[in-house]
Interface confidence: medium
């Protein structure tokens, strides 16, 4: 007659799976926000700093009502993964001023893909549709000059800090709703 | 460095107006929801409103629905708090503030707003 | 009244530590973040924890938070002469569709 069936498949607490995504989330901004003290007492910051190539901002104060899982997720998944990009590419160009940075930066990148891991089998325990695969990003220009690799690693880590501060309040806020 | 500057404040009579600001400098403003805040003298913190970084949201406190309006100038930097109808109660030094996400991680210094005859 | 509830004072000697608590319900503290500020006397106030229990940069770790079902608490560990001042706790609130604050508790270092 056959093997025995196995145990019956448990499917995940959703808000369990939530929680431990939060939590990775939360542990990612306080490293970033640690990353942005050090990089601004090394190189003070002045004025503001962007980088066109980085995500536009996808939360704010109104946009918290019509929140919908599968998009926060989607769209959290994109923005990390092009901050990803950046802070790779910033331990690859920014150069030799950033290295003072290093591990650290490096312990930043390895945790900022073990999130996105996270997201995806979120994604996947959830039974969400799975975005389609990422085009290829067009490569990133080395900084123009070492000043320019400083103010880029500004605007990453700081843009990185807003996202997952941000990302965290959207993810609370969505396990209520479940 | 980040730095948040209120004006305008000072002494207006009950169902006057007053318009504060709030120059912001040392950050992408236009990345901020920002927030208006206040305490009255002797008194604990407030929270009057809100405004999306685009300006595309706003909310405000129940107490000023309807008599208080929050806009932004991103081009500025600068934040605005329009007060009308003020009432006795109004009196308070009013803050600007800005929100990450859930939290006011910047205040300014504030600016005294007295209502009286 | 305030919609978040504070002891209105709390003290310590030097050294101690302290612990200052706030109370809500579940459309605040249950289902949002806590943020704690203080203000020194005559100063504007100053992020102190955010997201329950994360320290904002330059806050010594003497200062800790924690958040357990509607109910939140901030620690002072070491107490020192410059804590001497008001602490305020805040959370979004579902309900108000706003942020509320608790009333303040005014610490005095003996």
């Known amino acids: 007659p056959g093997p025995p069936p196995g145990p019956p498949r448990v499917s995940p607490d959703p808000r369990a799976e939530l929680d431990s995504t939060v939590l990775l989330t939360r542990s990612l901004l306080a490293d970033t926000r640690q990353l942005a003290a050090q990089l601004r007492d090394k190189f003070p910051a002045d004025g503001d700093h962007n980088l066109d190539s980085l995500p536009t901002l996808a939360m704010s104060a109104g946009a918290l009502g019509a929140l919908q899982l599968p998009g926060v997720l989607t769209r959290l998944r994109a923005d990390l993964l092009s901050y990803l990009r950046h802070v790779q590419w910033l331990r690859r160009a920014g150069g030799s001023s950033l290295k003072t940075l290093e591990p650290e930066l490096g312990t930043l990148q390895a945790r900022l893909d073990r999130l996105l891991r996270r997201l995806q089998l979120l994604m996947s325990r959830l039974a969400l549709p799975q975005p389609p695969p990422d085009p290829p990003a067009p490569p990133l220009a080395p900084p123009s000059s070492a000043w320019g690799g400083i103010r880029a690693a500004h605007a990453i880590l700081g843009g990185l800090h807003l996202t997952l501060d941000w990302a965290v309040r959207g993810l609370l806020l969505l396990k209520t709703r479940l | 460095e980040v730095q948040l500057l209120e004006s305008g404040g000072g002494l207006v009579q009950p169902g006057g107006s007053l318009r504060l600001s709030c120059a912001a400098s040392g950050f992408t403003f236009s990345h901020y929801d920002m927030n208006w805040l206040r305490q009255a003298p002797g008194k604990g913190l407030e929270w009057v409103g809100v405004?999306?970084?685009?300006?595309?949201?706003?909310f405000y406190a129940d107490f000023v629905k309807g008599r208080f309006t929050i806009s932004r100038d991103n081009s500025k930097n600068t934040l605005y708090l329009q007060m009308n109808s003020l009432r006795a109660e109004d009196t308070a030094v009013y803050y600007c503030a800005r929100t990450p996400g859930s939290h006011f991680d910047y205040w300014g210094q504030g600016t005294l707003v007295t209502v009286s005859s | 009244q305030s919609v978040l509830t504070q002891p209105p004072s709390a003290s310590g000697t030097p050294g101690q530590r302290v612990t200052i608590s706030c109370s809500g319900s579940s459309s605040n503290i249950g289902n949002n973040a806590v943020n704690w500020y203080q203000q020194l006397p005559g100063t504007a106030p100053k992020l102190l924890i955010y997201y329950d229990d994360l320290l904002p940069s330059g806050v010594p770790d003497r200062f800790s938070g924690s958040k357990s079902g509607t109910s939140a608490s901030l620690a002072i560990s070491g107490l020192r002469s410059e804590d001497e001042a008001d602490y305020y706790c805040s959370a979004w609130d579902d309900s108000l569709n706003g942020v509320v604050f608790g009333g303040g508790t005014k610490l005095t270092v003996l």
């Open positions: 405004i999306s970084y685009d300006s595309s949201n706003k």
